[in-house]
């Protein structure tokens, strides 16, 4: 018998979608071999309709896909826009169609439901509202109006015009009689439950001359939308529940065991700890719709998610809901990047941010995740030369090393800089990653003076002391501006005396400014790098003043001072400072703990065998 397993029968209706999961033993060979879905012909052959190698039959063009989940030993065939022509016998299998590694699946697509004789069919989603209209004749205008539900053989009174309400409908039903001109009454039922489905009868009058109208109420449990995202990528759940719940608390929950649906985030301020730093609930529109962005997807994020509206901020029967089944593909196109970066007070970090290399011209952004209320991510810097005022002189976004990675450098660190930061672009919204900056005990590795004052027309020399651990690194000075840090000439002055227990490999590298002008005022950085990969930096502010006494200035080490309009990121990106940013919705990454290395290159972390990755910014 074949080791492949799947659904033997699939029944659906025209216009629907199906999602057929086929299970296979997850051996190394099976995981990587061709997967296929084929239709069995009358003469016994099996014509491939779609395969994992990219083939899609013209019959399936634009309406089917096949996704392999090697870690689970499953692959999923999605087919949309079903028609009765799709009914037939199929196989899902591995390898070559004619071999035995397959499973037979019967797909039956029937016509959609038609109207019953004199019965009005109401098809409404779970949790929503239905209005059942009941016409009557003039002679019954003053008589009792009622709605019954057929339970087995017996009609059970649901509501009537004398004020009776069946206990099962308390607080969510009303009977409206239209003005005298219209011979119509209507029954409105809110917060529909699955148990509300069935045959109803509305009646005006109680004698043989009463007017009756049949209604068939179908309550649909929302079909989960299948969502496939890459590990370490991001997902956005767009939730549109209708204007009737615009003022009701919203939630996103994840179904766990049993009937529990654990709140992931809601508008009442609750957020699951596992999503700290990597989730945003974007403000709802007037129509009650909202979206939730989760970044840094983890394997364990896979599952069924429901969004809904209820005053409790969590799932209750009668909540209007939308559903998604999230699959997290471990064969991810998004590279591993450090999820925790460590730096010391007064030191610096260099963060590597991945982006889709096909979008090298996209605008890059870096923002600081804030957990208050529903979460937000105010922008700090972008690749177009904008830097938030408070970060001037200590934050730079560099396009290097390029080819799918950009670098963000933050120096003059304080404990207030600890937190979660998001890397993103205005291109592919799936490429949003989160990094956590942690401030640890220790001293900065690079030593520079504090405030420096230069005199107009004179020469200024500013020292930067590099410990011996950086002997193999390129050392540089640059002048900071909004678009980056422009390299300047510098002089290697030989070994530094600023470090105890540091040999001849330590270095003193000076920046010399000849004939100082007003234009020389500003922030200067010294730093280390290896090729296009940046490591630690230290910042010095140079002020320029009028001449007081002749001569050049040579500055010695002193305590460095930190230098002393908001753009906010949401899933639609608001227009900020006349910059409209096209929907770069949000993102994050798994927190993790590995060994902290003395790593000058704070942007290049080693990756351990688990999912946890860190990078060190400054050594202790």
């Amino acid at each position: 018998k074949s080791p492949i397993f799947g659904p033997e029968e699939v029944n659906s209706v025209e216009g629907n979608s199906v999602s057929i999961t086929c299970y296979y033993p997850p051996t190394s060979v099976n995981r990587h071999t061709r997967k296929y879905w084929c239709r069995q012909g009358a003469r016994g052959g099996c014509i491939t309709l779609i395969s994992s190698e990219g083939y899609v039959s013209s019959k399936y063009a634009g309406r089917a896909n096949l996704t392999n989940f090697p870690e689970n030993g499953t692959f999923v065939v999605n087919i949309a826009q079903l028609s009765q022509d799709d009914s037939g016998r199929y196989k899902c299998g591995l390898g070559i169609n004619s071999r035995g590694l397959s499973f037979d699946v019967s797909l039956e697509v029937s016509q959609g439901p038609g109207l019953l004789n004199d019965t009005k069919v109401y098809t409404v989603d779970l949790g929503r509202t239905v209005t059942i209209n009941c016409p009557f004749k003039t002679e019954n205008a003053q008589k009792r109006k009622s709605l019954y539900k057929q339970i087995g053989l017996y009609p059970v009174l649901v509501i009537d015009s004398s004020g009776y309400v069946n206990p099962n409908y308390t607080g969510r039903i009303r009977l409206d009689i239209q003005g005298t001109g219209q011979l119509l009454f209507s029954v409105v039922i809110n917060q529909l439950r699955l148990s509300d489905a069935g045959q109803y009868l509305c009646q005006a009058g109680d004698d043989s001359n009463s007017n009756k109208k049949n209604a068939d109420l179908q309550v649909l449990k929302p079909e989960p939308e299948l969502v496939y995202e890459d590990l370490r990528g991001s997902v956005t759940f767009h939730c549109a529940l209708g204007p009737e719940v615009a003022n009701v608390a919203k939630f996103l929950c994840r179904q766990s065991s049993g009937e529990n649906c654990d709140v992931v985030v809601n508008t009442l301020g609750k957020r699951a700890p596992a999503f700290e730093g990597r989730i945003l609930l974007n403000p709802q529109d007037k129509d009650g719709s909202f979206s939730v962005v989760i970044t840094g997807l983890r394997k364990e994020d896979a599952g069924r998610y429901l969004c809904g509206a209820h005053s409790d901020g969590q799932l209750q029967e009668g909540s209007p809901i939308q559903a998604w089944q999230l699959f997290v593909n471990e064969e991810s196109t998004i590279p591993r990047s450090p999820t925790v970066v460590k730096g010391v007070a007064g030191g610096s970090v260099a963060v590597l941010c991945p982006y889709n290399r096909k979008e090298s011209k996209s605008i890059k952004y870096w923002c600081l995740w804030e957990g208050a209320q529903n979460g937000r991510c105010p922008l700090l810097v972008d690749s177009e030369g904008w830097v938030k005022a408070q970060y001037e002189g200590r934050l730079s976004l560099l396009e290097e090393p390029g080819n799918g990675t950009f670098t963000v450098i933050l120096n003059q660190l304080t404990s207030r800089d600890a937190g979660f930061y998001w890397c993103l672009t205005n291109g592919d919204t799936l490429w949003r990653t989160t990094v956590e900056i942690k401030i640890i005990e220790g001293e900065p590795n690079l030593k520079v003076p504090g405030n420096v004052t230069a005199v107009l027309g004179e020469t200024l020399k500013v020292p930067c002391h590099f410990p011996c651990k950086f002997s193999s690194y390129e050392k540089y000075w640059c002048k900071w501006n909004n678009t980056g840090c422009q390299a300047l000439p510098s002089q290697d002055e030989g070994p530094s005396k600023a470090f105890v227990n540091c040999d001849e490999n330590s270095r003193l590298v000076s920046l010399t400014l000849n004939l100082v002008t007003r234009a020389d005022e500003g922030w200067y950085w010294c730093g280390v790098k290896q090729g296009h990969f940046y490591g630690e930096t230290a910042a010095v502010y140079v002020a320029v003043e009028e001449r007081k006494a002749a001569g050049s200035r040579d500055v010695s080490l002193a305590k460095a001072d930190a230098a002393p309009d908001e753009k906010v990121l949401d899933s639609g990106f608001r227009e900020i400072e006349n910059k409209a940013i096209q929907d770069p919705r949000l993102f994050a990454e798994e927190k993790a703990v590995a060994d902290t290395r003395d790593q000058a290159d704070g942007s290049r972390a080693s990756v351990d065998s688990g999912s946890s990755e860190e990078q060190g910014g400054s050594s202790r």
Partner: nanobody, 126 residues
Framework: QVQLVESGGGLVQAGDSLRLSCAAS????????MGWFRQAPGKEREFVTT??????????YYADSVKGRFTISRDNAKNTVYLQMNSLKPDDTAVYYC?????????????????WGQGTQVTVSS
Amino acid sequence: QVQLVESGGGLVQAGDSLRLSCAASGRTFTTYGMGWFRQAPGKEREFVTTITWSGSTNYKYYADSVKGRFTISRDNAKNTVYLQMNSLKPDDTAVYYCAASTVLRDPRVPTEYDYWGQGTQVTVSS
């Protein structure tokens, strides 16, 4: 919670038919799939069949040992799942359990199911 109550078990002759019912009550709006497992004395619980649904689409899974003889169906309005068992064999003798799941990754695995009924005895004599 979701409560499951099985009925329809009994003693039949080999070759006869039997129909089991499983009625679900409680928070059934969270369920996604319902199925049948069986356990013969001294043996492990064994997958028989499962039906999962998504909107108006049903997916039916069967164990090789019952293919072509057993049929699973459901009545959405009554929150009930049925197991029609034809051409019964003595090997089919077991306690049949109904199970329900909110998230089902592999329908053959008992631990994937969140709720279980008390079971109903089916005995097939030769």
